[in-house]
């Protein structure tokens, strides 16, 4: 999936299986990614588990679990708030669109989470105070906290190289993320479809093009569009909303 | 069981929660505590088997001794905020300040810096 980190780095990751997205003193988010096509290195999120840890007189521990075709509007225990403590309403789930869009507000940690199902796969977005982001007991154990550190270098897909291949008349080589490229989606069509929803040619737009070329699934256009929309709602600095390609930096920075 | 109503009335009467009041606020704090104790006694019949009730009772006892409040004395008219209609266990009235990050954050510094992370697509 495409990852926008807390430090505004944008990466395309092939991380497969279960990975920690956020892991701090208050909250743990784990995603499970699966290949979008047989033999493809590109993966998308098929499962998401969020654990809100027990916190003072505010909330009991609550677990939220979403999977493909199952986006619940309640925690795993059936409740929609933080339990039986006095501050239970400082954690609330709101169903925005049944089966498609859920918002979780954790006021006690100033955090808003948006989970969507777009097509077959899930998207995740969060707004969190820096103080909460950095509230970790053991900094050494935080190496693979994706939202904070990004994907390991060996798990990143070279977005720009793929795009260069796609723009050339040849089809991408077998070494590219998706050997099974659907012939039904020429580069021009992908560009046109993405332009419709994402007029600014930023990294969300580039991600959209990449996804259409990789899968041929137009739902990924919506995934990029909603990711940008959620960013508009959740990002505190509107000037930083659109990310653009930078020249290659240090390893682990923007892919 | 209306123990949560007692809790929220106490929290709103002592707007800084159960943190130590300034010395000149102690009589007012003790009055609010006695009101809280009276409220919990009234809920005893319908809350006596629930944890929230026992937590409140023990909490009151602790605060009473911490602040040297006498059991007898004036009670306060709490500055009650409008509460939502009484509901089931999934519905709660006002949360303590500690359960509202922005409110408690503003107590000790400027507005928090927010960050954003997103994951989507393939």
């Amino acid at each position: 999936p495409h990852l926008r980190t807390f430090t505004d780095h944008f990466q395309t990751c092939k991380v497969q299986g279960a990975w920690p997205l956020i892991d701090n003193n208050y909250l743990n988010v784990q995603v499970t990614n699966t290949p979008v096509l047989p033999g493809s290195a590109a993966t998308a999120t098929s499962k998401l588990t969020i654990i809100f840890k027990n916190f003072q007189e505010c909330v009991d521990q609550k677990v939220y679990q979403a999977e493909m075709d199952e986006l619940p509007s309640a925690f795993a225990d059936g409740s929609k708030n933080g339990g039986d403590k006095h501050g239970a309403n400082s954690l609330k789930i709101t169903e925005k669109v049944s089966g498609q869009h859920v918002e979780i507000q954790a006021k006690y940690i100033g955090t808003t989470i948006v989970v969507r199902q777009v097509g077959r796969y899930l998207t995740f977005a969060v707004r969190m105070p820096e103080e909460v982001v950095n509230a970790v007991e053991d900094r050494d154990s935080q190496g693979l906290y994706l939202c904070l550190r990004g994907c390991p270098l060996n798990q990143q897909i070279d977005f720009q190289a793929f795009r260069a291949n796609a723009e050339s008349p040849r089809r991408p080589a077998a070494a590219s993320p998706s050997p099974v490229v659907p012939e039904t989606f020429p580069y021009e069509t992908a560009v046109a479809k993405c332009k419709e929803k994402l007029p600014v040619e930023d990294l969300y737009y580039q991600a959209c093009v990449f996804d259409l070329l990789t899968t041929g699934d137009v739902n990924f256009t919506l995934a990029a569009y909603y990711a940008l929309e959620d960013g508009k709602m959740l990002h505190s600095n509107k000037d930083k909303l659109h990310l653009f390609e930078r020249t290659r930096e240090l390893p682990g920075a923007v892919a | 069981c209306k123990i949560l109503k007692c809790n929220s009335e106490f929290w709103s009467a002592t707007s800084s929660g159960s943190h130590a009041p300034a010395s000149d606020d102690v009589p007012e704090f003790c009055a609010a505590l006695r009101t809280y104790a009276l409220c919990t006694r009234r809920t005893a019949r319908t809350c006596r088997g629930d944890l929230a009730y026992h937590s409140a009772v023990h909490g009151i006892e602790d605060l009473m001794s911490q602040h040297n409040c006498s059991k007898d004395g004036p009670t306060s008219q709490p500055r009650v905020r409008t509460l939502p209609p009484a509901g089931d266990s999934q519905e709660r009235s006002d949360s303590p300040e500690i359960c509202h990050y922005e409110k408690s954050f503003h107590k000790h510094s400027a507005a928090p810096n927010y960050t954003h992370c997103g994951l989507f697509g393939d």
Epitope: S79 | K2, L51, S89
Partner: antibody, heavy 115, light 112 residues
Framework: EVQLVESGGGLVQPGGSLRLSCAAS????????MNWIRQAPGKGLEWIGM????????HYADSVKGRFTISRDNSKNTLYLQMNSLRAEDTAVYYC????????WGQGTMVTVSS | DVVLTQSPLSLPVTLGQPASISCRSS???????????LEWFQQRPGQSPRLLIY???ERFSGVPDRFSGSGSGTDFTLKISRVEAEDVGVYYC?????????FGQGTKLEIK
């Protein structure tokens, strides 16, 4: 959503014993007092007893005192009713209910005491 | 033990019309500090009881506002402002002021 599911009912002979269970979900079970209530066929409701959230106190109706015991296992989110020395008049649907005073009830389990 | 006596035991009502059920206690249900713990339950045919009203007059969550409770001391009333088909069933009053907790014998509401 609060859910209470009773089980363990069935046919038992007078003088026999039976243990009913009530599996709770959708709320923090260990925070609440719990009740057992019964309803004889075609009759009204009768409160049997209640147990505090931490099992520190139990209260019973006179009709079952000494014969019935309420217990709970908070680690399993389960409430129990141990019924001994059963009589024909104990035949009823047995309900568990959440709270010191009952708000949410289970669907009930039928206990028939007959020879 | 506190005895709760309901009347009438059977209540035929026309759809859309109001209905009223009385519950009388053998002793005052008011505690010394003025609190009264009386509840009303509805039991539809073949279903478990459901809490409607607690503390005499407080509607439980999800209960339509056509249901209301009132009373004090020993006399209590449950009112339905406009009876609907789904209101058919047996209604019980219940007291929690004294141990043992007790129910009224029930009032059966049916549609005329």
């Amino acid at each position: 959503e609060v859910q209470l599911v009773e089980s363990g009912g069935g046919l038992v002979q007078p003088g026999g014993s039976l243990r009913l269970s009530c599996a709770a979900s959708g709320f923090t079970f260990s925070n609440y007092g719990m009740n057992w209530i019964r309803q004889a066929p075609g009759k009204g409701l009768e409160w049997i007893g209640m147990i505090y959230y931490d099992s520190s106190e139990k209260h019973y109706a006179d009709s079952v005192k000494g014969r019935f015991t309420i217990s709970r296992d908070n680690s399993k989110n389960t409430l129990y009713l141990q019924m001994n020395s059963l009589r024909a008049e104990d035949t009823a649907v047995y309900y568990c209910a959440k709270g010191t005073t009952p708000d949410y009830w289970g669907q009930g389990t039928m206990v028939t005491v007959s020879s | 033990d506190v005895v709760l006596t309901q009347s009438p035991l059977s209540l035929p009502v026309t759809l859309g019309q109001p209905a009223s059920i009385s519950c009388r206690s053998s002793q005052s249900l008011e505690e010394s500090d003025g609190y009264t713990f009386l509840e009303w339950f509805q039991q539809r045919p073949g279903q478990s009881p459901r809490l409607l009203i607690y503390d005499v007059s407080e509607r439980f969550s999800g209960v339509p506002d056509r249901f209301s409770g009132s009373g004090s001391g020993t006399d209590f009333t449950l009112k339905i402002s406009r009876v609907e088909a789904e209101d058919v069933g047996v209604y019980y009053c219940f007291q929690a002021t004294y141990d043992p907790l007790t129910f009224g014998q029930g009032t059966k509401l049916e549609i005329k």
